[in-house]
């Protein structure tokens, strides 16, 4: 299917002008190639009428032009002084006329209505309000005022000053007669319907002295705004319906093949399941305007969308609406990032998030989509640090690998972490993406002891067991802080035969803190990576206490994979009972340890990677 997109139907009246905007993927080639507007003939050939290279056909001379906007990926064709002869089938496109990089546009130019002299024309969008002004002479001031609608040769009474209201206008029409001295009455019609379209007649008085005024009411369906977005990207519909419906329920719906409109989301809590995890209805402003964001755009999301207001939260005739025609470009610049990432309970996930690579300096964010009511997405972490305290020690956002991708690591997974998350930046909003985290059955690959207590001034050794499948990857320990995870210096003692062959059930990478200081308190992560790509991580909390007894503190490698509810009391180490203590304040006195940067600098902290049989080995 062609990636060029424009309006399918354009209609106007003789003598008027039209402006036709066509969209194209703004690749370097497309931006600079020829743009054209051509008319399809009976033979199927398309004859150029105007092009970006300066050509204008004789038929269009002096009344048409084509302007390219390469930075937006659009071009606009303006045609003035329209005549009935301009009605027909056209194409806007790129390159050569027959190549197929084009979009079909139907232009219909109709004759303007034959209106009686002095007719006032009112042009109003459906759902809005019109005020029809009706002048009268002094002698008709005390007489009956009325508004009729002309249907064929007959006139049907709509409203009069004797309190008659036509049932079709019930609860949405009023006739106002001003005070003395003002020789004009007004008829206000709210929530206009398409059926209200037509010629009206104001009348004051009767007989040959009556005052009459013709009013032509044109009720228009809102012209859909064309929206051109990339596959997998994000779209925002801004909906401003006016103060008069500020307190009425709002909705966004999509027009289906039966020309009815299926609710996508509304403020009453309804949401189409096809948009689960990837839609938000942003709160209303005081003026009643709101916006709807949809991420992870799919080809099947294409179509006509309407936003509106009604107490039922769905489309009803005569209520204000706004319209969009969404086109989803399959020649997307947005990469196919994961829609689902799976992790095991107790384990971790490393989520890769795409961003516009031209915006490497932009702030990166990760939020949790919540479906309740209109949906919301509270930020959990940003590139400058953690946002939500309850994720302390288990969430980090890394700028790596860079060049259009950042990484979010979440560990200590529980079933509560299952759900939808959004990758965002403060730059190009079209690059918002959604990922679903699923918790599956299985065991974490990395095994670390539960939370440990270290003694000031002594040596602490924390083992991390990894399986053979990770043997060829880089292993690391890092100290978590709310601004990231600072890698600790590693000791690479060269690979041993046993390590290279990985003939044991598991391998060991150990963190040594020597001597332990107050600043060492906190969360530590053991992880595997390949270059800038992160795999599994496991977290352990180290509490620091005053020296009570002599002797070094050491978590025995042999006991490091003890079950979570076991206590490892080897070599004088006391392990905190596993009570799912995610928050260190529950067992460490209320003390804030400032992150001093390289807290494990110099030779104080070291990482040793070895087999469980020998202390030699490699961390690579």
């Amino acid at each position: 299917k062609s990636p060029v997109f424009g309006p399918q139907e354009v209609s106007s009246v003789e003598g008027n002008s039209v402006s036709i905007k066509c969209y194209y993927p703004p690749t370097s080639v497309n931006r600079h190639t020829r743009k054209y507007w051509c008319r399809k003939g009976a033979s199927g050939r398309c004859i150029t009428l105007v092009s970006s290279e300066g050509y204008v056909s004789s038929n269009y001379a002096g009344r048409a032009n084509l302007t390219n906007f390469p930075e937006n990926g659009t071009f606009v064709v303006n045609i003035a002084q329209l005549s009935r002869d301009d009605s027909g089938h056209y194409k806007c496109g790129l390159g050569i006329n027959s190549r197929g990089l084009s979009f079909d546009v139907s232009l219909e130019v109709s004759q303007g209505p034959e209106l009686p002299n002095g007719t006032e024309v009112y042009t109003v969008d459906v759902g809005r309000t019109v005020t029809i002004k009706c002048p009268f002479k002094t002698e008709n001031a005390p007489k009956t005022k009325a508004l009729y609608k002309k249907i064929g040769q007959t006139s049907v009474l709509v409203i009069d000053s004797r309190n008659y209201v036509n049932p079709n206008y019930k609860d949405r029409i009023r006739l106002r007669i001003p005070g003395t001295g003002q020789l004009i009455f007004t008829v206000v019609i709210d929530r206009l319907r398409l059926s209200d379209h037509g010629l009206y007649l104001c009348q004051a008085g009767d007989g040959s002295n009556r005052d009459e005024k013709n009013a032509d009411l044109q009720v228009l369906e809102p012209e859909p705004e064309l929206v051109y977005e990339d596959l997998r990207g994000s779209v925002t519909f801004h909906c401003a319906l006016g103060l008069e419906v500020a307190n009425v329920a709002k909705f966004l719906c999509r027009v289906n093949s039966r020309e009815t409109c299926d609710v996508v989301i509304n403020t009453l809590g309804k949401r189409d399941s096809a948009f689960e995890g990837r839609i938000l209805l942003n709160p209303q402003d005081k003026d009643g305007s709101f916006s709807v964001v949809i991420t992870g755009l799919r080809k099947e999301d294409e179509g006509r969308y309407l936003c509106g207001a009604h107490s039922d939260g769905q489309l009803q005739e005569g209520w204000p609406i706004q319209a969009w025609q969404l086109f989803v470009n399959e020649e997307s610049t947005i990469p196919r990032s994961p829609t689902v990432v799976k992790g095991v309970a107790g384990g971790s996930v490393a989520v890769l998030c795409p961003y516009n690579p031209k915006e490497s300096q932009s702030l990166k964010y990760w939020c949790l989509w919540e479906g309740a009511q209109n949906g919301r997405c509270p930020l959990l972490v940003e590139s400058q640090g953690l946002v939500q305290e309850q994720y302390e020690g288990r969430l980090s956002l890394l700028q790596e690998p860079g060049n259009g991708t950042f990484t979010v690591i979440l560990n200590q997974l529980t079933t509560q972490d299952a759900g939808f998350y959004w990758c965002l930046t403060n730059g190009d909003t079209r690059w918002r993406t959604t990922v679903e985290i699923k918790i599956i059955e299985g065991e974490p690959n990395l095994k670390v002891p539960g939370n440990v207590t270290a003694v000031l001034g002594e040596t602490l050794n924390i083992p991390c067991h990894f399986p053979c499948k990770f043997s060829s990857y880089e292993k690391y320990w890092c100290k978590w802080s709310n601004t990231g995870c600072q890698t600790l210096p590693s000791q690479d003692e060269g690979p041993s035969e046993a390590f290279v062959n990985c003939d044991e059930n598991s391998r060991l990478v150990s963190l040594t803190l020597n001597p332990v200081t107050r600043a060492d308190e906190g969360w530590y992560w053991c992880g595997v990576k390949q270059g800038h790509f992160y795999g599994e991580t496991a977290a352990v909390y180290v509490a620091v206490e005053e020296k009570k007894v002599a002797g070094s503190r050491y978590v025995s490698p042999a006991k490091a994979d003890a079950a979570p509810d076991e206590k490892v009391l080897d070599s004088g180490v006391r392990e905190i009972e596993n009570k799912a203590i995610q928050d260190p304040r529950l067992f460490a006195e209320e003390k804030v340890v400032a992150d001093t940067g390289d807290q494990a600098g110099g030779s104080r902290a070291s990482v040793d990677s070895s087999s469980s049989e020998e202390q030699g080995g490699s961390s690579k």
């Epitope: 196919r336 994961p338 689902v340 990432v341 799976k342 961003y355 259009g404 299985g442 790509f533 795999g535």
Partner: nanobody, 138 residues
Framework: QVQLVESGGGLVQAGGSLRLSCAAS????????MGWFRQAPGKEREFVAV????????YYADSVKGRFTISRDNAKNTVYLQMNSLKPEDTAVYYC???????????????????????????????WGQGTQVTVSS
């Protein structure tokens, strides 16, 4: 939806070879990692091998390492399991499975090692075939 159909199973003598195929249809085959599992009577489903979406990364169960080779042909939407030096304990129903793999196209989301994902657990996979019987006689 993705539909998976296995073929190539049969009866073979110990020390012999078989080549299993799994043809996929439906959604984009090239964005899925493909795995093989097996289930012997009265036993749990066991991981055999997995291959990343590009074919650039593979991972095998210790019990088949060096004997089995997994490969894929994205043009044909097919994944293969070449089984050599077969043993009686390889007798089982072999299942093909597919799971969406993070980083399944370029330019900005490169491929992560398949070992970084919990692909040895059946619950990681989204779609399964009906299975093909492999019997190794002694």
């Amino acid at each position: 939806q993705v539909q998976l159909v296995e073929s190539g199973g049969g009866l073979v003598q110990a020390g012999g070879s078989l080549r299993l195929s799994c043809a996929a249809s439906g959604r984009t085959f090239s964005s899925y990692a493909m795995g093989w599992f097996r289930q012997a009577p009265g036993k749990e489903r066991e991981f055999v091998a997995v291959i990343s979406w590009s074919g650039g990364s593979t991972y095998y169960a210790d019990s088949v390492k060096g004997r089995f080779t997994i490969s894929r042909d994205n043009a044909k939407n097919t994944v293969y399991l070449q089984m050599n030096s077969l043993k009686p304990e390889d007798t089982a129903v072999y299942y093909c499975a597919s799971g969406e793999q993070p980083g399944s196209n370029r330019p900005y989301i490169p491929e992560q090692p398949i070992e970084f994902m919990p692909t040895d657990y059946p619950s990681w996979y989204d779609y399964w075939g009906q299975g093909t019987q492999v019997t190794v006689s002694s």
